[in-house]
């Protein structure tokens, strides 16, 4: 048993039929010694008396909010949560496996630049009775500080007959140098509590591997005289690391017809302009990627040809 | 990234072209190692990230762009210098700071070159003949070192008398390639920055 936060405890249980469970001793936080009684989840049934209560925790029926009272007055509470381990594996019932980039991916994280700021998100089909808390550090043996905000519900989506809820959190490395070469990964730990169930999820990554620039900005077309060609120009996104001559981007320019089946013309360039042929009803899109370290491409920025 | 990209103008800052070739070569070599050594721990998640130049060179700090010298987090590790303008020792106006940066890059290349050559000698003794270092990568290291045009004492190639442990050698190769790729990225960024200055 360990303390998750004040008056909230997690009991780790091997989860199999007729498992012996864990013996837990609860102590009433009071100077009183006599006349103390214990109840579970505000039911009227008295579980025991005395300053301590010893319980055998085997299943969810044994978890919940234990309260000690004296003469009708509440003295203290202890909330017991269960963390299930089945066949040696901790349960992952609360979050949805996003399966990207590989199976058992529950947390996904992205950074728009090398400033040490990143966003992580996760999915669940659970709508209420759900709390998350997020901690992060650089390295685990001698951890360096990363500060995370509160997890918030960032999107709701309907998937077939079911609703899916996306939660996200923003974190910032306390002392990050954008030019640094990372040798220790960032560790992100999410504690998830659904009713009486506790689970934890972790992700480990280097900022350089989760970089996804914002799309190029100010995408413009300039027709070239007496030609079907146009000059496409754009700028680095505002959120990208500076100086741009050090943190350089490379770009992919795509001409796409109205029909998805039409052949796409693609050009790759390190410059912030390109000359392409603009077909009728087509659109021109540009996306960006770190020039030297191939992490994710940005989303497309697009303009119509007409 | 095997994609059509416009090649730089040959009249540009001389080292930029070499550094781009270096990054391409080490990335290709790392990809080849990952594929060939698929049953070895060779991915970024599996290996220990070691830097053989740690406490010997200070490339990141010595080559820090001027704009980042205001960031205290970039200055906290060592007495730091930063690069100003110049070109790859092609101009007499090369500043002292820049010379420090480029000599640090040169020392990195020399240390990796020695390590890779020693390792290749061991890999050539492997009866499985599973993997060898790409001669192109070694040649590109050499070319960039020549372009940097520093004279420094030659580091003797390490020779070992004991029987090589090929498993350990292959894991060390992965560690070395990952670290060298990260350093090659830094070198490329530095050269791009200098070229724009």
């Amino acid at each position: 048993i360990w303390e998750l936060k004040k008056d909230v405890y997690v009991v780790e249980l091997d989860w199999y039929p007729d498992a012996p469970g864990e013996m837990v001793v609860l102590t009433c936080d009071t100077p009183e010694e006599d006349g103390i009684t214990w109840t579970l989840d505000q039911s009227s049934e008295v579980l025991g008396s005395g300053k301590t209560l010893t319980i055998q925790v085997k299943e969810f029926g044994d978890a919940g909010q234990y309260t000690c009272h004296k003469g009708g007055e509440v003295l203290s509470h202890s909330l017991l949560l269960l963390h299930k381990k089945e066949d040696g594996i901790w349960s992952t019932d609360i979050l949805k496996d996003q399966k990207e980039p590989k199976n058992k991916t529950f947390l996904r994280c992205e950074a728009k630049n090398y400033s040490g700021r990143f966003t992580c998100w996760w999915l669940t089909t659970i709508s209420t009775d759900l709390t998350f808390s997020v901690k992060s550090s650089r390295g685990s043996s001698d951890p360096q500080g990363v500060t995370c905000g509160a997890a918030t519900l960032s999107a709701e989506r309907v998937r077939g007959d079911n609703k899916e809820y996306e939660y996200s959190v923003e974190c910032q490395e306390d002392s990050a140098c954008p030019a640094a070469e990372e040798s220790l990964p960032i560790e992100v730990m999410v504690d998830a509590v659904h009713k009486l169930k506790y689970e934890n999820y972790t992700s480990s990554f280097f900022i350089r591997d989760i970089i996804k620039p914002d799309p190029p900005k100010n995408l413009q077309l300039k027709p070239l005289k007496n030609s079907r060609q146009v000059e496409v120009s754009w700028e680095y996104p505002d959120t990208w690391s500076t100086p741009h001559s050090y943190f350089s981007l490379t770009f992919c320019v795509q001409v796409q017809g109205k029909s998805k089946r039409e052949k796409k013309d693609r050009v790759f360039t390190d410059k912030t302009s390109a000359t392409v042929i603009c077909r009728k009803n087509a659109s021109i899109s540009v996306r960006a990627q770190d020039r030297y370290y191939s992490s994710s491409w940005s989303e497309w920025a697009s303009v119509p040809c007409s | 990234r095997n994609l059509p990209v416009a090649t730089p103008d040959p009249g540009m800052f001389p080292c930029l072209h070499h550094s781009q070739n270096l990054l391409r070569a080490v990335s290709n070599m790392l990809q080849k190692a990952r594929q060939t050594l698929e049953f070895y721990p060779c991915t970024s998640e599996e290996i220990d990230h070691e830097d053989i130049t740690k406490d010997k060179t200070s490339t990141v700090e010595a080559c820090l762009p001027l704009e980042l010298t205001k960031n205290e987090s970039c200055l906290n590790s060592r007495e730091t210098s930063f690069i100003t303008n110049g070109s790859c020792l092609a101009s007499r106006k090369t500043s002292f700071m820049m010379a420090l940066c480029l000599s640090s890059i040169y020392e990195d290349l020399k240390m990796y070159q020695v390590e890779f050559k020693t390792m290749n000698a061991k890999l050539l003794m492997d009866p499985k003949r599973q993997i060898f270092l790409d001669q192109n990568m070694l040649a590109v290291i050499d070319e960039l070192m020549q372009a940097l045009n520093f004279n420094s004492e030659t580091v003797p190639q390490k020779s070992s008398l004991e029987e090589p442990d090929f498993y350990k050698t292959k894991i060390k190769l992965c560690i070395l390639l990952h670290a060298f790729r990260i350093r090659a990225v830094t070198i490329d960024r530095v050269m791009s920055y200098l070229n724009a200055s």
Epitope: G61, Q65, D161 | -
Partner: antibody, heavy 117, light 107 residues
């Protein structure tokens, strides 16, 4: 002892509104959700929504969104469910129940609402 | 929306016999399932929560099992007071949903 006591039966005309109350006692009111469940004559149970004063959250069944409002008054430990634009198929017994970790463990006695012109 | 399907709709059992009631969820609800008993003119009464935990004061002859999408309520030896309608309900994801009910009647 935990108790949920509901207001008395109501007869309403179509288009009218009804407000059912549920007075809780014997536990810390703000620690639990109050859920509302209805049962049409001879039919099964249908969940309408819930309100948690502790977290200030409401959780409505989409079917009733826009027609139902659930509130609480902590000073009297009373929960309310108002259903507007009543139709004849809203004729049912309306139950309140408390819920936290263990399902809906205590229920009110039910309030019969009849909608008839 | 998660649909809870109960079977059979009616179960005719003699007193003293075992009754097995089934409940299937249209998607996984982990073990967030409760079972209720309802007698005519009364409010439902909680029997089982978290799929297999007997609520305070519920006799040991009632037991629940299952997880994911398939759940079972078993009454090991039916007593006369057990003849009633039984509902399963998921509170894993909103909207909470009840099964259509299984009426256990005297054979």
């Amino acid at each position: 002892e935990v108790q949920l006591v509901q207001s008395g039966a109501e007869v309403k005309k179509p288009g009218a509104s009804v407000k059912v109350s549920c007075k809780a006692s014997g536990y810390t009111f703000t620690d639990y959700w109050i859920e509302w469940v209805r049962q049409a004559p001879g039919q099964g149970l249908e969940w309408m929504g819930g309100f948690s004063h502790g977290s200030g959250s409401t959780n409505y069944n989409e079917k009733f969104k826009g027609r139902v409002t659930m509130t609480t008054d902590t000073s009297t430990s009373t929960a309310y469910m108002e259903l507007r634009s009543l139709r004849s198929d809203d004729t049912a017994v309306y139950y309140c129940a408390r819920r936290r970790f263990r399902g809906m463990d205590y229920w009110g006695q039910g309030t019969t609402v009849t909608v008839s012109s | 929306e998660i649909v809870m399907t109960q079977s059979p709709a009616t179960l005719s059992v003699s007193p003293g016999e075992r009754a097995t009631l089934s409940c299937k969820a249209s998607q996984s609800v982990s073990n967030d399932v409760a079972w209720y008993q309802q007698k005519p003119g009364q409010a439902p009464r909680l029997l089982i929560y978290y799929a297999s935990n007997r609520y305070t004061g519920i006799p040991a002859r009632f037991s629940g099992s299952g997880s994911g999408t398939e759940f079972t309520l078993t009454i090991s030896s039916l007593q006369s007071e057990d003849f009633a309608v039984y509902y399963c309900q998921q509170d894993y994801s909103s909207p909470w949903s009840f099964g259509g009910g299984t009426k256990v009647e005297i054979k």
